[in-house]
Interface confidence: low
């Protein structure tokens, strides 16, 4: 986690040191995207650019001064959501030769502005290039629980850039838009949002056709070119622009390192508390156990005699009962040897009542400080009780 | 073999629509995108769009954007192509041929459909 | 949208003669071009895809070859059935486009 980055984000639009955020687009040969990009203050010109590969140059594909590039004429729009403090480019059509780095900017100078770089591929639907190499399978302990987990038609975070393919893909006739800027029909484009599920429905990863997953889901997992902005794993392009308020911004950067690191922290914070219980049970039972034996070594010997050589261990590991053995903890008492004498009655030396109690069960912390999973603590049956036979 | 099946010829009068079938054989219909292409008697060819069999994602030419409709069935694995609105000027013939394949890889239009012919007549 | 010229309109050789047929894209179509031979009353076929690779069954006298906006289709020796209409067609940038064609007649 570069920290030390941050304030670089915070640096003036035309600062040279600025570190640009990158956003990955992945387009349907065919389809169109939403390139989405940080707006400025009001009142200055907007564009998007293309980098050129020789001269590295970014020429201008659209802007607010009603220019677009002769290529992309009839197929870009560009929406400003000052509320939202961001501006949409719409590119429609998308042809192979539209792969490239384009980058978002403010002011008049377009090389000088650069406000977001974003590289767009345009493929098949097919194969898209996060789908080359297989994805790292997050590690069980890392799923989110469940109030974390976020409807799958979340709207997507500021990363994940919206990808318009067909909406419906069922026999539903293909709405047409009246804007000359569009021709081609997503069947049918219900405010930009598409449920993909088709005649044959494909399987990539979970689904290629439904949502972008959970937001969080998409923090969680490394914005690599493999992975890039998908979450968009599945397919589906839903942009809701009105629940999109509280993410858009590009303070947004920052807000992921800080769930993350909250996340940790939790996380952090529950096993070092788990712990100090776990030490202060253990020492307490241990100073239980001492004044026991004390009591135990008075009550039980002769004034004169030498401690009994066959005293129970009892620091030896609990004994497992059955489910419905009794709380009170009536252990066995090992069965003396034929000849032996037989030893006073068995002393139940029980622990304080509430600690028997069947819902309050406890591991023998004092023999394993193994730390067994949440999921686990609720089920284990190792009832803690101490028999101490004389 | 590999090929596509075309519907037969059609004679529509002006204001009229035409829907032209395209049958796959030899290959699965969403395996393929399927192009549309026109050619008017002596004259060269013209591009009307495009349609993915697989999700139904369709683009179409500014020329017939608002007009035409490509769609398609696959369970009989059919696509078809529908002009609304005809006039003289669509009298044709009308091609359905396979496009980009499934794993991305774009050979060209490799199979082409036998031609449906439509006539636009009052 | 991308204009795609071919030349000649038409172009008399006789069999065995070397044929050369150009296509000029109005911009850049990369190497997003293919080359189509049509006889009278037939489908098109599809003989050279993406500027310079020949199609399944098409015979080595057919090579294509250019990138940017200008693309040649080569036709080394003809052969009698190599007679017919040729078309270019782009795929850059949409709409797809083809050339107004270049019919090959003998001579």
């Known amino acids: 986690m570069d920290f030390w980055l941050w304030p670089l984000y915070f640096l003036p639009v035309s600062g040279a040191l600025r570190i640009l955020p990158e956003v990955k687009v992945e387009g349907e040969l065919g389809g169109s995207v939403t390139i989405k990009c940080p707006l400025p203050e009001m009142h200055v010109r907007i564009y998007l650019c293309r980098e050129m590969a020789g001269s590295g140059t970014c020429g201008t594909v659209v802007s607010t001064t009603n220019f677009i590039k002769a290529e992309y004429k009839g197929r870009v729009t560009l929406k400003q959501y000052p509320r939202k403090n961001l501006f949409l480019v719409e590119v429609t059509q998308l042809t192979e030769s539209d792969s490239g780095v384009y980058a978002c900017g403010a002011g008049m100078n377009t090389d000088r502005g650069k406000t977001q770089k974003v590289t767009l591929n345009v493929h098949s639907e097919y194969e898209p290039s996060w789908e080359e190499q297989p994805m790292p399978e997050t590690p069980k302990w890392f799923h989110l629980p469940y109030l974390f987990q976020m409807p799958a038609y979340a709207s997507s975070s500021k990363f994940v850039t919206r990808v318009t393919t067909p909406a419906q893909r069922g026999k539903v006739p293909p709405v047409h838009h009246s804007s000359p800027t569009t021709q081609i029909t997503h069947r049918p484009r219900v405010s930009r949002a598409s449920s993909v599920a088709g005649d044959k429905p494909r399987t990539f990863l979970p689904s290629t056709t439904a949502s972008k997953i959970s937001a969080l889901e998409g923090l969680l997992k490394p914005q690599t070119p493999s992975y890039n902005h998908h979450t968009r794993l599945h397919r589906q392009r839903a942009l809701d622009y009105g629940s999109q308020s509280g993410r858009e911004g590009q303070g947004f950067h920052i807000l992921i390192p800080t769930i993350l690191g909250l996340f940790l922290l939790a996380l952090l914070g529950l096993v070092v508390k788990r712990a100090v219980e776990r030490r202060k049970a253990l020492s307490r039972r241990a100073r239980r156990l001492a004044v026991r034996m004390r009591a135990l070594e008075s009550s039980q010997r002769p004034r004169g005699s030498p401690r009994p050589r066959s005293q129970n261990n009892i620091y030896s590991a609990c004994p497992r009962r059955a489910r419905g053995a009794d709380a009170a903890g009536t252990g066995e008492a090992p069965v003396p040897g034929p000849g032996a004498p037989l030893p006073p009655a068995p002393l139940q030396v029980s622990e304080s009542p509430w600690l028997h109690a069947p819902s309050l069960k406890t591991s023998c912390e004092y023999v394993s400080l193994y730390h067994q999973p949440a999921a686990m603590m609720e089920d284990s049956d190792s009832d803690d009780y101490i028999n101490v036979p004389a | 073999q590999v090929q596509l099946v075309q519907s037969g010829a059609e004679v529509k009068k002006p204001g009229a629509s035409v829907k032209v079938s395209c049958k796959a054989s030899?290959?699965?219909?969403?395996?393929?995108?399927v192009n549309w292409v026109r050619q008017a008697t002596g004259q060269g060819l013209e591009w009307m769009g495009w349609m993915n069999p697989n999700s139904g994602n369709t683009g179409y030419a500014q020329k017939f954007q608002g007009r035409v409709t490509m769609t398609r069935n696959t369970s009989i694995g059919t696509a078809y192509m529908e002009l609304n609105s005809l006039t003289s000027d669509d009298t044709a013939v009308y091609y359905c041929?396979?496009?980009?394949?499934?794993?991305?890889?774009?050979?060209?239009?490799?199979?082409w459909g036998h031609g449906t012919t439509v006539t636009v007549s009052s | 949208e991308i204009v795609l010229t071919q030349s000649p309109a038409t172009l008399s050789l006789s069999p065995g003669e070397r044929a050369t047929l150009s296509c000029r894209a109005s911009?850049?179509?990369?190497?997003?071009l293919a080359w189509y031979q049509q006889k009278p009353g037939q489908a098109p076929r599809l003989l050279i895809y993406d500027a310079s690779n020949r199609a399944t069954g098409i015979p080595a006298r057919f090579s294509g070859s250019g990138s940017g906006t200008d693309f040649t289709l080569t036709i080394s020796s003809l052969e009698p059935e190599d007679f017919a209409v040729y078309y270019c067609q782009q795929r850059s940038n949409w709409p797809w486009t083809f050339g107004q064609g270049t019919k090959v007649e003998i001579k």
């Open positions: 030899g290959y699965t219909l969403t395996s393929y995108d």
């Open positions: 041929a396979r496009g980009r394949s499934i794993i991305n890889h774009y050979y060209g239009l490799d199979v």
């Open positions: 911009q850049s179509v990369s190497s997003y």
